[in-house]
């Protein structure tokens, strides 16, 4: 699995809605694959982490002044929706096909 | 200044192009305000860090399993351009009014 020593990448993160208290309104699924972005943004930043110019600059400054400036951070750069069955205000079970921004599609250095 | 104990915010970061080796092609300015996103993404995530649903989920999972899952990360969510004077292929000094993605406009938790 991707630790701090490995480079920025998408790793598995199974989220159980009961664990985060969302089971009160999300009926199904009980859990889903959220994924997590893990790993370091090390110099040189590879193309696959789609660095912005600012991330490249920050990485270079960190290289020169590691105690003054942090590295860029490995974060979701593109998210995907999931489908959820939830209770509406009237308590009616309703399907939302595209509940946006719930699952990581891509990770990158920002 | 914003340390790890403070919440996610934009802080000053003056970047000297000579320090990062970009003075070989950027003639002016000699330095610029890049800004840096610093601080933690603590529960509950405030509106001003414009959290995605995934960031909210990850924050909740971190709260439940702090050793298994990391917090969301404080990163640039909007970048601004700067103007730079550079030498083109013929060595002609040329002004690029909008060199995109060089300076942080907004920080957020992702």
């Amino acid at each position: 699995s991707a630790g701090a020593g490995s480079h920025c990448q998408k790793t598995s993160l199974r989220v159980n809605f009961e664990d985060i208290g969302w089971d009160s309104w999300i009926i199904a699924p009980k859990e889903y694959e959220a994924y997590e972005c893990k790993g370091g943004c090390f110099f040189p930043l590879a193309d696959d982490v789609t660095p912005t110019k600012h991330a490249i600059v920050q990485t270079l400054v960190h290289l020169k002044f590691p105690t003054k400036v942090g590295k860029a951070c490995c974060v979701p750069t593109k998210l995907s929706p999931i489908s959820v069955l939830y209770k509406d205000d009237m308590g009616v079970p309703t399907l939302k096909y595209h509940y946006e921004g719930m699952s990581v599609a891509e990770c990158g250095c920002r | 200044s914003a340390g790890a104990g403070s919440h996610c915010q934009k802080t000053s970061l003056r970047v000297n192009f000579e320090d990062i080796g970009w003075d070989s092609w950027i003639i002016a300015p000699k330095e610029y305000e890049a800004y840096e996103c610093k601080g933690g993404c603590f529960f509950p995530l405030a509106d001003d860090v414009t959290p995605t649903k995934h960031a909210i989920v990850q924050t909740l999972v971190h709260l439940k399993f702090p050793t298994k899952v990391g917090k969301a990360c404080c990163v640039p969510t909007k970048l601004s351009p700067i103007s730079v004077l550079y030498k083109d292929d013929m060595g002609v000094p040329t002004l690029k009014y909008h060199y995109e993605g060089m300076s942080v406009a907004e920080c957020g938790c992702r």
């Epitope: - | 002016a28 000699k30 330095e31 610029y32 103007s83 004077l85 083109d88 002004l95």
Partner: antibody, heavy 119, light 111 residues
Framework: EVQLVESRGGLVQPGGSMRLSCAAS????????MNWVRQAPGKGLEWVAH??????????HYAESVRGRFTISRDDSKSSVYLQMNSLKTEDTGIYYC??????????WGQGTLVTVSS | DIVMTQSPDSLAVSLGERATINCRAS??????????MNWFQQKPGQPPKLLIY???NQGSGVPDRFSGSGSGTDFTLTISSLQAEDVAVYFC?????????FGQGTKLEIK
């Protein structure tokens, strides 16, 4: 080697017209702003006009002293820039330099051509 | 228009000595942390040649004895050790705003 070669100038009467041309070589002409700068006899330099790039819709700008009388144009396929001068005045007399450059500087200069407006 | 004023109008300096030419703009020619100030050298019978750009950067093939400094409205061109071939007229020029304008020129001669 960069070269800018202006057409021969000459003598023209006040109120008359003249067209200058400038042929460029040694650089990618279409990538550079083109300008005309003039110098009255024994005097300083005065920017006359410039024409920008195709991506700028060939935008033109003129010095107040020539606006409405002079027209700058370019033909990227011929690597040439032109200055059409109408309603010439005696104060338009001088050496006319064709210059190429960026949005920041006059980088390349021709040798200049003398235009004399006199009766 | 931005008016560029040079001083002195003419200058006589001994060979090997330092020559200093000043240029003042009627308003700041700095923007985005960049100085929109250039210096040109014109020898008799020749077109101008770019000496210094962005206030302090040497043009291609320009000898190290030529240097520029300043920001905002006040700029200086310095020749550290005058050579015979430096006899010329020197012009400052701003490119911050159209119309791009030149100083009136400073004639440099050998004393």
């Amino acid at each position: 080697e960069v070269q800018l070669v202006e057409s021969r100038g000459g003598l023209v009467q006040p109120g008359g017209s003249m067209r200058l041309s400038c042929a460029a070589s040694g650089f990618t002409f279409s990538n550079y702003w083109m300008n005309w700068v003039r110098q009255a006899p024994g005097k300083g330099l005065e920017w006359v006009a410039h024409i920008r790039l195709k991506s700028d819709n060939y935008a033109t700008h003129y010095a107040e002293s020539v606006r409405g009388r002079f027209t700058i144009s370019r033909d990227d396929s011929k690597s040439s820039v032109y200055l059409q001068m109408n309603s010439l005045k005696t104060e338009d007399t001088g050496i006319y330099y064709c210059t190429g450059g960026s949005n920041y500087v006059f980088a390349f200069w021709g040798q200049g051509t003398l235009v004399t407006v006199s009766s | 228009d931005i008016v560029m004023t040079q001083s002195p109008d003419s200058l006589a300096v001994s060979l090997g000595e330092r020559a200093t030419i000043n240029c003042r703009a009627s308003e700041s020619v700095d923007n985005y942390g960049i100085s929109f100030m250039n210096w040109f050298q014109q020898k008799p019978g020749q077109p101008p040649k770019l000496l210094i750009y962005a206030a302090s950067n040497q043009g291609s093939g320009v000898p190290d004895r030529f240097s520029g400094s300043g920001s905002g409205t006040d700029f200086t061109l310095t020749i550290s050790s005058l050579q015979a071939e430096d006899v010329a007229v020197y012009f400052c020029q701003q490119s911050k705003e159209v119309p791009w304008t030149f100083g009136q020129g400073t004639k440099l001669e050998i004393k």
